[in-house]
C-alpha cells in the first residue's frame, strides 16, 4: 500500500471528509477524470487538479496536526505526477505563481501571446494543422 | 494568418506590450514551454498557462475596446488546445472555478484524494506501477 | 558549518562486506536527501545510491543493485551503506553527499560532499 | 540510461575565457536540472553550478551554466581564468530513476 492511503485516511478525519453526505451533489474531480481516457486530455485536467491540492496543503501549512500527512501526500504526488522531476515541479509550480493582477505579468502574458498560442496544439510542432470546423464561441 | 494574430497585436497595443522592456527579467511561459517536449508534460504546462490566460481575459471582460479581439483569441484558443471539444472545456472550467476556501468543497477534494492520487501516475489504468525510487520529500 | 565525515573503509576480500557510515552535522539532517557517489582511482564520478530524508525512498545504480543497501539513522544524523557481496571494481573512495534542496525535492544535486573514505577489494 | 558526454580535456590562457560542453545522449537535456563540479587534485568535488545555472554562494560570477536545447548539452563557462581554476569539472544530471556524472573534463590553464 503507498504512504499516501493511511496520511489520507487521517486528512478525512481532520476534515471531517469521509461521511457519506460528502458525495452528495456530485464529485469534483472523480466524474471528470472519468470522461478523459487519452493521457494528453488527462493530463490536462490533472494538472488543474494537483495545483488545486497544492493551494490546499498551502493553507492548512500552519496545522501542525497533519504537517506529516500533508508531506507524505505532497512527496507522493511529486513522485507520481512529475515523475520525481523537480524541474517539471519547479516549472509548474512558477506558473502557479504567476499574479493575473500583476501589470508587468500581464504585459509580458500579452507579449508572448501569439507564440504561446503556435504551441498550443499538438500538431504545432510537426506541421500546419487544419483548423477544426468545429463552432466554439468564448 | 491564424486569426488570433491580428487580435493579439492589438492586445499588444491595449496592453502597452510590445516594447522591448517587456522582455526584460525573462519570459513568463516561453522559457517553460521550451524544457518540455513530451506532449504530456506540455499539457502540464499548457494547461496552467490557458488558465492563467482564460483568468486574465475575464478581468477585462467588461472592456469594450478589446471584446473581439479577446473573443477571437478564446475561440482559436479552444480551438486548438481544447480541440474543439466542448465538454473538454466545460470540465477545465469546472475544475479551474473550485474555490480552495469553500468547505463543502475542501471536504469532497479529501474524500476523493485517494482516488485522484491512484490515477496520477501514466501507468495507474494499465496494472500496479513500481514506485519510484527517486527522492521526493513533501 | 555543514560538514559531513565518512569513515568504516578499508581492505577487503572479493565477496566480502564492509559498512560505511558518514556523519553529519550543521543542518537539519532528516529535512535533506543524501547520496553516495563513489571515484575510482584516477577515474571519473560515480553515482551509487540515494535515500530520501525520512529514509522512505530509495534508490540505486544499476551496478550495485541488490548488493549495496543505504540507510540513515535520523536521531543519530547518520548516513549509512551497507556493501556486501564485494568485486574489485567496486575499489573507489566513497564520498558522502547532501542534496541542496530542502524538503521533498527531488535529488537533483549535491552541495556538501565529504572528504571521503577509500574503500579496496582485493584478495 | 542516457549518457553526459564531456571533452577529455581543455587548456586556456589566464585572463582568457573557456567554455566546456556536456551533451546528453538520449532525452531532453531541459528536462533536468544540470549541476556542475569542481574537483582539485587531492580534493572532494565542491558545487559550482547548480540548476542549470545558479551559483553557490562563495562561487564567483566567473563561473556560469547554461543549458542549450538545440544541441541537447549545457555549458560551463569560466572567464578571467585563473590558476586556481586548473581542476577536473563535471557535469550531473538525472532521470527519474538515475543520476548520472559525466566523465569529466581536465582544465589545464597555461
Known amino acids: 500500500q503507498d504512504p499516501y492511503v493511511k496520511e489520507a485516511e487521517n486528512l478525512k478525519k481532520y476534515f471531517n471528509a469521509g461521511h457519506s453526505d460528502v458525495a452528495d451533489n456530485g464529485t469534483l474531480f472523480l466524474g471528470i477524470l472519468k470522461n478523459w481516457k487519452e493521457e494528453s486530455d488527462r493530463k490536462i485536467m490533472q494538472s488543474q487538479i494537483v495545483s488545486f491540492y497544492f493551494k490546499l496543503f498551502k493553507n492548512f501549512k500552519d496545522d501542525q496536526s497533519i504537517q506529516k500527512s500533508v508531506e507524505t501526500i505532497k512527496e507522493d504526488m511529486n513522485v507520481k505526477f512529475f515523475n520525481s522531476n523537480k524541474k517539471k515541479r519547479d516549472d509548474f509550480e512558477k506558473l502557479t505563481n504567476y499574479s493575473v493582477t500583476d501589470l508587468n505579468v500581464q504585459r509580458k502574458a500579452i507579449h508572448e501571446l501569439i507564440q504561446v498560442m503556435a504551441e498550443l496544439s499538438p500538431a504545432a510542432k510537426t506541421g500546419k494543422r487544419k483548423r477544426s470546423q468545429m463552432l466554439f464561441r468564448g | 494568418q491564424d486569426p488570433y494574430v491580428k487580435e493579439a497585436e492589438n492586445l499588444k497595443k491595449y496592453f502597452n506590450a510590445g516594447h522591448s522592456d517587456v522582455a526584460d527579467n525573462g519570459t513568463l511561459f516561453l522559457g517553460i514551454l521550451k524544457n518540455w517536449k513530451e506532449e504530456s508534460d506540455r499539457k502540464i504546462m499548457q494547461s496552467q498557462i490557458v488558465s492563467f490566460y482564460f483568468k486574465l481575459f475575464k478581468n477585462f471582460k467588461d472592456d469594450q475596446s478589446i471584446q473581439k479581439s479577446v473573443e477571437t483569441i478564446k475561440e482559436d484558443m479552444n480551438v486548438k488546445f481544447f480541440n474543439s471539444n466542448k465538454k473538454k472545456r466545460d470540465d477545465f472550467e469546472k475544475l479551474t472555478n473550485y474555490s480552495v476556501t469553500d468547505l463543502n468543497v475542501q471536504r469532497k477534494a479529501i474524500h476523493e484524494l485517494i482516488q485522484v492520487m491512484a490515477e496520477l501516475s501514466p501507468a495507474a489504468k494499465t496494472g500496479k506501477r513500481k514506485r519510484s525510487q527517486m527522492l521526493f520529500r513533501g | 558549518e555543514v560538514q559531513l565525515l565518512e569513515s568504516g573503509g578499508g581492505l577487503v576480500q572479493p565477496g566480502g562486506s564492509l559498512r560505511l557510515s558518514c556523519a553529519a552535522s550543521g543542518f537539519t539532517f532528516s529535512s535533506y536527501a543524501m547520496s553516495w557517489v563513489r571515484q575510482a582511482p584516477g577515474k571519473g564520478l560515480e553515482w551509487v545510491s540515494a535515500?530520501?530524508?525520512?529514509?522512505?525512498?530509495?534508490y540505486y545504480a544499476d551496478s550495485v543493485k541488490g548488493r549495496f543497501t543505504i540507510s540513515r539513522d535520523n536521531s543519530k544524523n547518520t548516513l549509512y551503506l551497507q556493501m556486501n557481496s564485494l568485486r574489485a571494481e567496486d575499489t573507489a573512495v566513497y564520498y558522502c553527499?547532501?542534496?541542496?534542496?530542502?524538503?521533498?525535492?527531488?535529488?537533483?544535486?549535491?552541495?556538501?560532499w565529504g572528504r571521503g573514505t577509500m574503500v579496496t577489494v582485493s584478495s | 540510461n542516457f549518457m553526459l558526454t564531456q571533452p577529455h580535456s581543455v587548456s586556456e590562457s589566464p585572463g582568457k575565457t573557456v567554455t566546456i560542453s556536456c551533451t546528453r545522449s538520449?532525452?531532453?537535456?531541459?528536462?533536468?536540472?544540470v549541476q556542475w563540479y569542481q574537483q582539485r587534485p587531492g580534493s572532494s568535488p565542491t558545487t559550482v553550478i547548480s540548476e542549470d545555472n545558479q551559483r553557490p554562494s562563495g562561487v564567483p560570477d566567473r563561473f556560469s551554466g547554461s543549458v542549450d536545447s538545440s544541441s541537447n548539452s549545457a555549458s560551463l563557462t569560466i572567464s578571467g581564468l585563473r590558476t586556481e581554476d586548473e581542476a577536473d569539472y563535471y557535469c550531473?544530471?538525472?532521470?527519474?530513476?538515475?543520476?548520472?556524472f559525466g566523465g569529466g573534463t581536465k582544465l589545464t590553464v597555461l
Open positions: 553527499a547532501k542534496d541542496h534542496s530542502s524538503g521533498w525535492y527531488v535529488i537533483s544535486g549535491m552541495d556538501v
Open positions: 535515500i530520501s530524508g525520512s529514509g522512505g525512498s530509495t
Open positions: 550531473q544530471s538525472n532521470d527519474s530513476d538515475n543520476v548520472v
Open positions: 538520449s532525452g531532453s537535456i531541459a528536462s533536468n536540472y
